[in-house]
């Protein structure tokens, strides 16, 4: 058989952050190539990454068509230089991925504090609304556009001079918090989707502290 040295892919894994979605698998190919197919539960298979020697395939363009659908992918193995060859059952070797629902499973990317502004004893902290690769009407949607009120942010803030952290939450991209006059504060934010069962939280944003150039201070 022409497939004697062909092995099926294994360890198929979805890697997805803010809907940028890549399927990874093993092994590194030796005398073989791969083609990936993706489908929704009720849809037709679409081929991607034809006859590649890579062990990953970017499927973002497919999943962003409807991030609430559940997707299944499969990786076909072919002998290098003889991609028409089939296995003993009359079709190429392939392995199925786990199911993947982008809306429920994509990792939330590390957020960024866009700005903070102090007015007297109030500080307004704004989180950047990151653009995703999800499109509608030829425009890219932001994370907030996609998740709406399902997405909240948690703010951690503390006096520069102490380690005791306070928290605040918002279902928008802005916080308005009370601070002590004359004190400098540091801030970090985390994206959270409370309704999820997996991948509920992002990593924390980089810390930003008052007295640095990102913020603005106004004495009233």
């Amino acid at each position: 058989s022409g497939t004697t040295n062909t092995v099926a892919a294994y360890n198929l894994t979805w890697k997805s952050t803010n809907f940028k979605t890549i399927l990874e698998w093993e092994p590194k190919p030796v005398n073989q190539v791969y083609t990936v197919q993706i489908s929704t539960k009720s849809g037709d298979w679409k081929s991607k990454c034809f006859y590649t020697t890579d062990t990953e395939c970017d499927l973002t363009d497919e999943i962003v068509k409807d991030v609430k659908q559940t997707y299944l992918a499969r990786v076909f193995s072919y002998p290098a230089g003889n991609v028409e060859s089939t296995g003993s059952a009359g079709e190429p070797l392939y392995e199925n991925s786990p199911e993947f629902t982008p809306y429920l499973e994509t990792n939330l990317g590390q957020p960024t504090i866009q700005s903070f502004e102090q007015v007297g004893t109030k500080v307004n902290v704004t989180v950047e609304d990151e653009r995703t690769l999800v499109r509608r009407n030829n425009t890219f949607l932001s994370l907030r556009d996609v998740f709406g009120k399902d997405l909240i942010y948690t703010l951690y803030y503390w006096k520069s001079s102490s380690s005791g952290k306070k928290t605040a939450k918002t279902n928008t991209n802005e916080f308005l918090i009370d601070v002590d006059k004359g004190e400098n504060y540091c801030f970090s934010v985390q994206a959270v989707i409370p309704s999820r069962t997996v991948n509920r939280k992002s990593t924390d944003s980089p810390v930003e502290c008052m007295g640095q150039e990102k913020g603005e201070f106004r004495e009233i």
Epitope: K68, N137, D150, E174
Partner: antibody
Framework: QVQVQESGPGLVKPPGTLSLTCAVS????????VSWVRQPPGKGLEWIGT???????YYNPSLKSRVTISNDNAPNTVSLKLSSVTAADTAVYYC??????????????WGQGTLVTVSS | DLQLTQSPSTLSASVGDRVTITCRAS????????LSWYQQKPGKAPKLLIY???TLASGVPSRFSGSGSGTEFTLTISSLQPDDFATYYC???????????FGQGTKVEIK
């Protein structure tokens, strides 16, 4: 073709229940929300409520005790029920698609509307 | 409850005029920007013009533009065309789960 279309009786007797159906085509209710909006003759638009792409419902506080929106009766349809109707509920009723899929107020596809008269 | 107040209620203008309609919210709209503008002609369904405060909806002429944030928003028609005489509504989502609201409308009529 992406469209929504309202249907239901044009006359309802008080204090009965107004029941309308919105048939959608060309898009998935698992990805887009649907809102109901009404317009009394010669007056402005009033938001009734929304069912989002996750099936959660949101209602105008002034109508909340009387309104139910659901999409579990048939595939690709959203229903509106408004109970204990009075003449003040006489209006053109519209269903419309929510562009973002949640209760965002951005309604990009509208039905032609159906006039419901409440009268005995 | 979220309340949206449009001004003016009626606006008389001529073809070629620059027209501005204001929408004020009783409290900040959701994430300061989820406000939409609609055009409605008699006997017809409303048509989405602008969403997310400033994004032009598909197929809408570029003479329409939107701006604003938080509680104050404007719809501008840079050069009024005969087809633009209609009633305009703003609509917004609010941070609380329940509320979406429409403004009372602004009728743009021929001077």
């Amino acid at each position: 073709q992406v469209q929504v279309q309202e249907s239901g009786p044009g006359l309802v007797k008080p204090p009965g229940t107004l029941s309308l159906t919105c048939a959608v085509s060309g898009f998935s209710l698992s990805y887009y929300g649907v809102s109901w909006v009404r317009q009394p003759p010669g007056k402005g638009l009033e938001w009734i409520g929304t069912i989002d792409s996750s099936g959660r419902t949101y209602y105008n506080p002034s109508l909340k005790s009387r309104v139910t929106i659901s999409n579990d009766n048939a595939p690709n349809t959203v229903s509106l029920k408004l109970s204990s109707v009075t003449a003040a509920d006489t209006a053109v009723y519209y269903c419309a698609r929510d562009f973002y899929g949640w209760n965002s107020g951005a309604l990009d596809i509208w039905g032609q509307g159906t006039l419901v008269t409440v009268s005995s | 409850d979220l309340q949206l107040t449009q001004s003016p209620s009626t606006l008389s203008a001529s073809v070629g005029d620059r027209v501005t309609i204001t929408c004020r919210a009783s409290q900040s709209v959701y994430s300061n920007k989820y406000l939409s503008w609609y055009q409605q002609k008699p006997g017809k369904a409303p048509k989405l013009l602008i969403y997310k405060a400033s994004t032009l909806a598909s197929g809408v002429p570029s003479r329409f533009s939107g701006s604003g944030s938080g509680t104050e928003f404007t719809l501008t028609i840079s050069s009024l065309q005969p087809d633009d005489f209609a009633t305009y509504y703003c609509a917004a989502a609010y941070s609380d789960d329940s509320d979406t609201a429409f403004g009372q409308g602004t009728k743009v009529e021929i001077k």
